[in-house]
């Protein structure tokens, strides 16, 4: 999938499997990824595990899990709240849209996030105090923790060479993440496709075009547009926003 | 103990919330206070020892006297904005302070600095 | 996370005194009533007395009447069982839990009465 | 004072099997409102008691939904649906609706 980090940095990760997305003294979040099509690296999420943990007088531990076509509108013990404490309202999930979109909000941590099922797949969003994004009891320890340190290097799909390729009159396949790119979806397509939801040429706007090139599918367009979106309503610099492309950096050294 | 559940229906049922209520509005105002005051009895049981069950006593006693209503009389429907939906078994509602992280952690300081992550697509 | 440690148990003969203390976190003490339970060994649990959240009431069980005082410090997050006139029968785990009707227990002390 | 009376005093069950423990009162645990306020406490061997329900029915928060409670006046029940391996302990009832508030002798569950 692709990965906004706390740091603004925007990257493309095979990340197959079970990995941390977020893990502080607060609250734990890890995601499942799938590959898209069989034998392609690149993956999207098929599951998502929220726990969070137990905190003072406000709310007990409350786990939130939500799969492919599963999108709950409630913790995994059916509640709607953080349980029998006082502060038990500082956790509460609403439901945005019925097996689409739920939006977490945890107060106590002033914390809001937003899960949403697009198509076949999960999007993952969240706003959240640089005080509790660093709320961490072992600094060292934390070294996969995807939203702040980023994918690793090995984990990384260079998605901006692989637009050279797919830019280029004959695409090889070979160069694709995918060894099933699908034909039916030409180049100028997944740009029509991507810009018609996506007007600004962003890295939003470039992701959707990789996926449909990628995947021929085309909810990953509504997949980015709604990235986008939930980035709209919980970054608190809209200055950033919109990410471009920047000169090579070394992934994975986000911290 | 459930006292926040009456206090948080006390709030929802006045509209104007914890300021005065205009002269027409009291009889309303002290129905809900009958209300409130109902709800708080019914908890004694369960929150006699805590400190928001004698708040809400001594804060409904007050509010009785500064706005002339009477121990008896009609009591009202509270139009509940926020509480959990009837299924669900969880029904505490107002928070402590620290359970409300902007007023919690940044009482002496400016507002804290927010970040985004997100993840989607392939 | 509420946590209620309990301390001060011990052996001690009939007739002779001891005084119990609980260390509370993970939520404001000062806003609760407080607690104490016992249960004797292989037996069932006893519910001793409770104190309110700022020690302007207290209730006991007619077992422990005239004998056992709650008192608490709310500044040092402590809630106290000072137990007198011990007798065999006292002899039990000691249990401090929190609210006016206990939600959340310690893991207890023990109280052993025996000459 | 209020005695609470629970049977059976010993309880083998069959794992996934359904389990069910009455309490009763000796006078009703219903208030002039109309609320009733008794509730059960599970006791794992070794631990702490860890309250289940309030309110005769209310579970308390992180409790499995295979527990449930019930039961109006003197008679009340603790129900679980599917006993799991977990649920060993001794189960207590507890009526805080009058003073002293008093705790039933406790039933034993073990698995058979």
């Known amino acids: 999938p692709h990965l906004r980090t706390f740091t603004d940095h925007f990257q493309t990760c095979k990340v197959q499997g079970a990995w941390p997305l977020i893990d502080n003294n607060y609250l734990n979040v890890q995601v499942t990824n799938t590959p898209v099509l069989p034998g392609s690296a690149a993956t999207a999420t098929s599951k998502l595990t929220i726990i969070f943990k137990n905190f003072q007088e406000c709310v007990d531990q409350k786990v939130y899990q939500a799969e492919m076509d599963e999108l709950p509108s409630a913790f995994a013990d059916g509640s709607k709240n953080g349980g029998d404490k006082h502060g038990a309202n500082s956790l509460k999930i609403t439901e945005k849209v019925s097996g689409q979109h739920v939006e977490i909000q945890a107060k106590y941590i002033g914390t809001t996030i937003v899960v949403r099922q697009v198509g076949r797949y999960l999007t993952f969003a969240v706003r959240m105090p640089e005080e509790v994004v660093n709320a961490v009891e072992d600094r060292d320890s934390q070294g996969l923790y995807l939203c702040l340190r980023g994918c690793p290097l090995n984990q990384q799909i260079d998605f901006q060479a692989f637009r050279a390729n797919a830019e280029s009159p004959r695409r090889p396949a070979a160069a694709s993440p995918s060894p099933v790119v699908p034909e039916t979806f030409p180049y100028e397509t997944a740009v029509a496709k991507c810009k018609e939801k996506l007007p600004v040429e962003d890295l939003y706007y470039q992701a959707c075009v990789f996926d449909l090139l990628t995947t021929g599918d085309v909810n990953f367009t509504l997949a980015a547009y709604y990235a986008l979106e939930d980035g709209k309503m919980l970054h608190s610099n809209k200055d950033k926003l919109h990410l471009f492309e920047r000169t090579r950096e070394l992934p994975g050294a986000v911290a | 103990c459930k006292i926040l559940k009456c206090n948080s229906e006390f709030w929802s049922a006045t509209s104007s919330g914890s300021h005065a209520p205009a002269s027409d509005d009291v009889p309303e105002f002290c129905a809900a206070l009958r209300t409130y005051a109902l709800c708080t009895r019914r908890t004694a049981r369960t929150c006699r020892g805590d400190l928001a069950y004698h708040s809400a006593v001594h804060g409904i006693e007050d509010l009785m006297s500064q706005h002339n209503c009477s121990k008896d009389g009609p009591t009202s429907q509270p139009r509940v904005r926020t509480l959990p939906p009837a299924g669900d078994s969880q029904e505490r509602s107002d928070s402590p302070e620290i359970c409300h992280y902007e007023k919690s952690f940044h009482k002496h300081s400016a507002a804290p600095n927010y970040t985004h992550c997100g993840l989607f697509g392939d | 996370e509420v946590q209620l440690v309990e301390s001060g148990g011990g052996l001690v003969q009939p007739g002779g005194s001891l005084r119990l203390s609980c260390a509370a976190s993970?939520?404001?003490?000062?806003?609760?009533?407080m607690n104490w339970i016992r249960q004797a060994p292989g037996k069932g649990l006893e519910w001793i007395g409770m104190i309110y959240y700022d020690s302007s009431e207290k209730h006991y069980a007619d077992s422990v009447k005239g004998r056992f005082t709650i008192s608490r410090d709310n500044s040092k997050n402590t809630l106290y069982l000072q137990m007198n006139s011990l007798r065999a029968e006292d002899t039990a785990v000691y249990y401090c839990a929190k609210g006016t009707t206990p939600d959340y227990w310690g893991q207890g002390t023990m109280v052993t009465v025996s000459s | 004072d209020v005695v609470l009376t629970q049977s059976p005093l010993s309880l083998p069950v069959t794992l996934g099997q359904p389990a069910s423990i009455s309490c009763r009162s000796s006078?009703?645990?219903?208030?002039?409102?109309?609320?009733?306020?008794l509730e059960w406490f599970q006791q794992r061997p070794g631990q702490s008691p860890r309250l289940l329900i309030y309110e005769v029915s209310t579970r308390f928060s992180g409790v499995p939904d295979r527990f449930s409670g019930s039961g109006s006046g003197t008679d009340f029940t603790l129900k679980i649906s599917r006993v799991e391996a977990e649920d060993v302990g001794v189960y207590y009832c507890?009526?805080?609706?009058?003073?002293?508030?008093?705790f039933g002798q406790g039933t034993k569950l073990e698995i058979k």
């Open positions: 507890f009526q805080v609706t009058h003073d002293p508030m008093t």
């Open positions: 006078q009703s645990l219903e208030t002039s409102d109309g609320d009733t306020f």
């Open positions: 993970g939520f404001t003490f000062s806003n609760y009533g």
